[in-house]
Interface confidence: low
Amino acid sequence: KTLCSMEEAINERIQEVAGSLIFRAISSIGLECQSVTSRGDLATCPRGFAVTGCTCGSACGSWDVRAETTCHCQCAGMDWTGARCCRVQP
């Protein structure tokens, strides 16, 4: 599923403000995070977790997030994909 332009703009804005005060405030409430690595071009977070970042093998710098829970690396022949997954601690 592709993201609409509004969602793209929001995601790009999130990248820009990632180091801002609002993120520091969020981090103070307590996040539980873990990394997931999968073979191929998809990595899916566990139930209840959302993607906060993606990483790709083969020096691929091109990725997108699907349904807020899955990282998709966009280069051909991807050997691995990693997702950083977080949720607010219950």
């Epitope: 599923k1 592709t2 332009s5 793209e8 995601n11 790009e12 990248q15 083969s58 020096a59 691929c60 710098g61 091109s62 990725w63 997108d64 690396c73 966009q74 280069c75 051909a76 022949g77």
Partner: antibody
Framework: QVQLQESGPGLVKPSQTLSLTCTVS??????????WIWIRQHPGQGLEWIGD???????QYNPSLKSRVALTLDRSKNQFSLQLSSVTAADTAVYYC?????????????????WGKGTLVTVSS | SELTQDPDVSVALGQTVTITCQGD??????ASWYQQKPGQAPVLVIF???NRPSGIPDRFSGSSSGDTASLTITGAQAEDEADYYC??????????FGGGTQLTVL
């Protein structure tokens, strides 16, 4: 203003290697923000994606050409190059270089925002 | 081609015309559109389904539904007469173009 300019021989003999270079101005090929593309257009025909290269050295190729194509880049000259081996008359085309903003951290792209003017390469003995 | 376009389309000056691009990959991935005039390099007119680069008139717009992407020119001008190509990616990240549509403005 971003500009791309193709250069290389306009005539190549069959079975030889076609070599073209694209010189980029107004943007750095060392920026992670872009992939650098080669596209060709046979006379009177449509466009064909040949392949692309990222500053990291990551490449992608058209499967139909993969066995004959090599892409490289020269960061010091802000250039990237195409080599197509074992050419035949079927490789006669206008060759374009272009830029794809796909390399940005949030991975959108797969379109070509700047193009060179193109250079005609004829394969003939 | 894995992306299919009608080879020829015509439109009366000032009228609206839609050029289509069909392919299964378009169910998952955006199409982009390029305008090419004789002897010139292609020019990007629409990207990410319906975004215009700076300098492209707002009479150009894009849309998609199912396996079909569309380029619409609302109020076609004589200077819009050109070949139009769509392109998109597949799941492996390789790219392809449609066969092109020659637009004639009558």
């Amino acid at each position: 203003q971003v500009q791309l300019q193709e250069s290389g021989p306009g005539l190549v003999k069959p079975s030889q290697t076609l070599s073209l270079t694209c010189t980029v101005s107004g943007a750095s090929i060392s920026s992670g923000g872009y992939r650098w593309i080669w596209i060709r257009q046979h006379p009177g025909q449509g466009l064909e994606w040949i392949g692309d290269i990222h500053y990291s050295g990551s490449t992608q190729y058209n499967p139909s050409l993969k066995s004959r194509v090599a892409l490289t880049l020269d960061r010091s000259k802000n250039q990237f190059s195409l080599q197509l081996s074992s050419v035949t008359a079927a490789d006669t085309a206008v060759y374009y270089c272009a830029r794809d903003p796909r390399g940005h951290t949030y991975g959108y792209g797969y379109y070509f925002d700047y193009w060179g003017k193109g250079t005609l390469v004829t394969v003939s003995s | 081609s894995e992306l299919t376009q009608d080879p020829d389309v015509s439109v009366a000056l000032g009228q609206t015309v839609t050029i289509t691009c069909q392919g299964d990959r378009l169910r998952r991935y955006y199409a982009s559109w390029y305008q090419q005039k004789p002897g010139q390099a292609p020019v990007l007119v629409i990207f990410r389904k319906n975004n215009r680069p700076s300098g492209i008139p707002d009479r150009f717009s894009g849309s998609s539904s199912g396996d079909t992407a569309s380029l619409t020119i609302t109020g076609a001008q004589a200077e819009d007469e050109a070949d139009y190509y769509c392109n998109s990616r597949d799941t492996s990240g390789t790219l392809s173009f449609g066969g092109g549509t020659q637009l004639t403005v009558l």
